[in-house]
Structure formats: structure tokens, C-alpha cells
Amino acid sequence: MEMEKEFEQIDKSGSWAAIYQDIRHEASDFPCRVAKLPKNKNRNRYRDVSPFDHSRIKLHQEDNDYINASLIKMEEAQRSYILTQGPLPNTCGHFWEMVWEQKSRGVVMLNRVMEKGSLKCAQYWPQKEEKEMIFEDTNLKLTLISEDIKSYYTVRQLELENLTTQETREILHFHYTTWPDFGVPESPASFLNFLFKVRESGSLSPEHGPVVVHCSAGIGRSGTFCLADTCLLLMDKRKDPSSVDIKKVLLEMRKFRMGLIQTADQLRFSYLAVIEGAKFIMGDSSVQDQWKELSHEDLEPPPEHIPPPPRPPKRILEPHNGKCREFFPNHQWVKEETQEDKDCPIKEEKGSPLNAAPYGIESMSQDTEVRSRVVGGSLRGAQAASPAKGEPSLPEKDEDHALSYWKPFLVNMCVATVLTAGAYLCYRFLFNSNT
């Protein structure tokens, strides 16, 4: 198969970073004026991830129709998706208003609420104990009807009620709970099993509005999910897998939302998923059972509050010249959250050579990108960057990855400093008390 050959060749030559960089430079760039309005500052999770004006979802609200969400309309595949950021505490009502107004049946969540010790998303659906949530700003009520917890994903049946009209709708919440804190899933089996679960539910059928897909910024993992689904759909429609060009499809998708697929690693994983998924599309129905087996969905899920331990960093393939984020005091910025798809500020010049590691070029061990989380104020110490067209202007290198890479060294330094300081203080204390 063409795609498989291409995959092997890129793997062999180690050129995923270069290919990913080409995509980033070719990507569309459109205005995001509404997203940048001062009144919408607190409706954006990350300063540099905004919906394009032409494809943004508009809430049916007179005072402010803005939500950080984009409609991705794939004409040939005849599939539409709404990609959105993980809801903020102040936008949960807007999120469900969008689900209601767009007549969506499915919500796909690809992150955990808490990852790597920081909040990636508000708790926007009711947990068992609470049973229901009322969003007074949009006059909607959300009830948890049932929950099917598998080892690596959970499917929730929710009931969304418009309190004004008392109309209700069943919403299916597909929550992929085991995307690793660093990098991408080890194999595409569990991811494909999850994708096909969403498909089988009818949530993607034209009877309903577009499925709502989110991670933290709604561009990395979310892009991966939609890219894989669209490519597999096109393969099915065309009956000729070799005619599907993943890069072209991704560039088409990037006309609707910036930054889809945030790392070279995610791009590589998308290829893997499509290559594996194509086996099923081309008539090998046994592979679906294999995915199910390989994904061990019926095992006990890991405890939700204990995130999987970060993988130790692999050998860095690209020089990692990122500077880690500054600490912002006084909560002007509510922590520059790392997000499932984000990275550390790294200066990028438009024509920078690959070995200068422009932001977004990933070592094969990570997929997280830092996004500046906005509430107010400005980013101090951020370097001037000339980003790729249509690309988020702040980085995609993982600050947590950088920290984990240096952690042993830093810990030793800290311990040595503390011990030295302690010894010095003891000495001073003893010396002073003797005189």
C-alpha cells in the first residue's frame, strides 16, 4: 500500500519533523478577529489558539455569540466535526449551548481533566455523586444517565434538557482516558477501537449535527481523531486507499482550524492509525477484534486520580533549545497550562533551518505543547516569534518534557543547595551562639 511505503520511508529517513514542518508552513492562515476581541479574552483557554472568523461556531446569543470552536466541514467525506477547546469554568454553559444549538449527539473528549498536575479542562459533565448540573447562564440542565467504564475509555449517556422548553436530548460522551502524558498512544489499536465505538454509536451519522471533539486546546489530539476518521472515510468512499493523501487531507482541515495535529509524533501516529484502520476498510473484519483484544478494554481502568507516570524521555532527535516558561505571579495568567498538545516557547524564524528546532518540531517522545493560558496581562519574557502561517504563535514544545529531561540534574542541584545552605546556617548558628 502506498501509504505504508511512504510511512516506512519517512521512518527510515527520520524525516517526520521535516514533513510536519512543511505542513505547518503550507497551512492556511485566516483572520481570527472575533477571538481576539478584549471581551472574549476570558473565553479562550490559550492565547494563541483561536478559531478563524469564517469557520467559528456562533452561539445563538444576542450579547456575545463567541465560543472557541470551529466547524470542520469535509465535503468529499461528507462529515463535519466541531473542534473546540476544553471548556473553562466560565464557558461550560456555552459549550452545552453549542451542543444543543448544533444538534450534536456525540461529544468526544481526548484528555483527562487533570494531566501532568495541571487542569486541562473544567469538569463540565456531572459525576455520579452529583447526578445533575444546571447551567444557569444558558438555562440548560445536564443529567448523568449511565456510565460504561472500560480500561482506557468511558462512555457516558447524558441527558441535556432545555429548561425553557423542557425538551431533552440524549448525548453520548466518549471519553478517551489514557492518552499518555507524553507522546502518543503506543499503538493505534485502542485508539481505533475507540474511534469505531464512536462510529457505531451513530453519533457521526448525518441524522445528527456535527460531533463535538475536544482535548485541551482542540487542535492536537482532536486533529488526530478527525484526521484518522476522515482519511478512513475517504478510503471507504473511493475504494482506493492509495489515493488518500493524509497530508492533503490535513491541509484541507487546517483551512477550518489552526494548528491541527500539533507534533510530528501526532502526524506519525495518524499515519499509523490510518494504515491499520485501512485493513478493516478494505474488508479484513478480523482486525476489529484484534484491536479490541490488543486494547484490553475490559481490564480494570487505572484510578482516575493517578495519572500514568510520564515516560522517560527518549534520545532527543532534534536539538531542544526551548526556554521553559516563566512563572507568572499574581494570577494575572492562570498558569500557563501545558496541554495535551502543547509545548515550550521556542523562537521560530520563518526560514529557520531544521536543526534550529523551530517550535512544533517534536522529538518522538512527546506531544504536549504549552499554550499561554489567558485571563489578563501580557506574556512577559516571551520571545518574538514569526510563526508559520496559520500556526499558533506560541510554541509547541513541551515544557514538562524539558523539565523531566533536566529533572535529575535540577533535583541534585536543589538538594546540594539546600544541604549547603543548611550546613552554613548551622555553622553560623553554632558559631554565633559560642561567641
Epitope: K103, R105, T143, I145, Q157, E159, E161, N162, T164, T165, Q166, E167, T168, R169, E170, G202, S205, E207, H208
Partner: antibody
Framework: EVQLLESGGGLVQPGGSLRLSCAAS????????MSWVRQAPGKGLEWVSS????????SYADSVKGRFTISRDNSKNTLYLQMNSLRAEDTAVYYC??????????WGQGTLVTVSS | DIQMTQSPSSLSASVGDRVTITCRAS??????LNWYQQKPGKAPKLLIY???SLQSGVPSRFSGSGSGTDFTLTISSLQPEDFATYYC????????FGQGTKLEIK
């Protein structure tokens, strides 16, 4: 194609009971709220009852409260209306309707209920 | 309960005419107003929902407007198949219908 097919209507004596069914097809039944609307011969339309998508919430017109019970079986794609203590004024064609976007967007062909001695 | 008053209750018109039917709510219902067409012996059919949105498959000669308490259904150029009874309905529980407007051939 969305289809709603009512059954269970007929002639019943005042004070009697009847159970109407509505078989749904061509759409994801469990996603939608459903309703019953009736129309007395030569008269206008009157909303009777609605039920939430999960079946957990119900509402009724004052004229039938305490006598009629709406229910659904999502596994069978079927909506029901249990009618007890029937009165002459309940005589009507009963329509099953899908309640979506605050409107009755699809209707069945109706089943006639006649309450007479 | 919210009362819906439709006018006129009956109306004679010719093919090609522009026809307007009005509906008034006893209190504000925002845009929760729908219009239905019913032919003798048939189930009602949704034409317009949310005051002005055209239901899929409905000809564009039908249009709706209004919000709050006053609403209008307009048929821009009457066709032979449009002669029927029209009902408005408000979408705030308990849901109520107007008494209907019978549109007849002149």
C-alpha cells in the same frame, strides 16, 4: 426515512382504559423527546403529554393529568400512552410526534380513540 | 397557560396570491413559535420552527417572522397544494396551539 406508526386505538366505554403504542423507525429514537398530541373530530390540535429522551421526565396537559401515563422503551423504539378513566371528551385522533428543536417535527398518521357507551 | 390567537380563522385566496396569517401569544414566548399545515384526514406537517426557520423539505415560498408575542406566516405565491388549515404553536410548556386558519380557494 423517519416513520412513526400509532396503534391501539378503538372504541372504549367511559371509565375504561386503552394503551396506545407508537413504533418509531428511521432515526435514533433514544436521542429525542417524544409527545402525544390529539385532535377531536372537527376541532383543533391539543398537546397531551411529553416524555424526555431517557424516559425519566414526563409532563401532561391539565386535562389528562392523573389519568394518562406516557412511557417509552428505547430498546424497542416504542412510545406508549396508557389512558385510564376515559371520558367522552377524550374522543380524538391521537398522534405520536417527535419533539425536536421545540417543535413537533415528525408526526404519525394517528389512531382514533372513541369513548362512547 | 399561554393562549395563542390566530387570525383570520378562515381566508379565501387565489393561486399566485400573497397570503399572511398572524398569531399572537398572551405573553412573550421569545422565538419559540412554530407553524404547521394540515390537510383533511392527514397528520399536521411542520413548516416553520423557531419563528423563522424553514423546516427541511418545505418550499421557500413559506416564511415566518416575529418574536415576543406577535408572529406572521407568509406564503409568497399561493400554489394549489397550499389550500389547507394552518396552525401556530408555542414551545413553552404546557404547549398550546392556535385555533387554526382555514385557507380556501376563492
Amino acid at each position: 426515512e423517519v416513520q412513526l406508526l400509532e396503534s391501539g386505538g378503538g372504541l372504549v366505554q367511559p371509565g375504561g382504559s386503552l394503551r396506545l403504542s407508537c413504533a418509531a423507525s428511521g432515526f435514533t429514537f433514544s436521542y429525542y423527546s417524544m409527545s402525544w398530541v390529539r385532535q377531536a373530530p372537527g376541532k383543533g390540535l391539543e398537546w397531551v403529554s411529553s416524555i424526555s429522551s431517557s424516559g425519566g421526565g414526563t409532563s401532561y396537559a391539565d386535562s389528562v393529568k392523573g389519568r394518562f401515563t406516557i412511557s417509552r422503551d428505547n430498546s424497542k423504539n416504542t412510545l406508549y400512552l396508557q389512558m385510564n378513566s376515559l371520558r367522552a371528551e377524550d374522543t380524538a385522533v391521537y398522534y405520536c410526534a417527535r419533539w425536536f428543536s421545540s417543535a413537533f417535527d415528525y408526526w404519525g398518521q394517528g389512531t382514533l380513540v372513541t369513548v362512547s357507551s | 397557560d399561554i393562549q395563542m390567537t390566530q387570525s383570520p380563522s378562515s381566508l379565501s385566496a387565489s393561486v399566485g396570491d400573497r397570503v399572511t396569517i398572524t398569531c399572537r401569544a398572551s405573553q412573550s414566548i421569545s422565538s419559540y413559535l412554530n407553524w404547521y399545515q394540515q390537510k383533511p384526514g392527514k397528520a399536521p406537517k411542520l413548516l416553520i420552527y423557531a419563528a423563522s426557520s424553514l423546516q427541511s423539505g418545505v418550499p421557500s415560498r413559506f416564511s415566518g417572522s416575529g418574536s415576543g408575542t406577535d408572529f406572521t406566516l407568509t406564503i409568497s405565491s399561493l400554489q394549489p397544494e397550499d389550500f389547507a388549515t394552518y396552525y401556530c404553536q408555542q414551545g413553552v410548556p404546557p404547549y398550546t396551539f392556535g385555533q387554526g386558519t382555514k385557507l380556501e380557494i376563492k
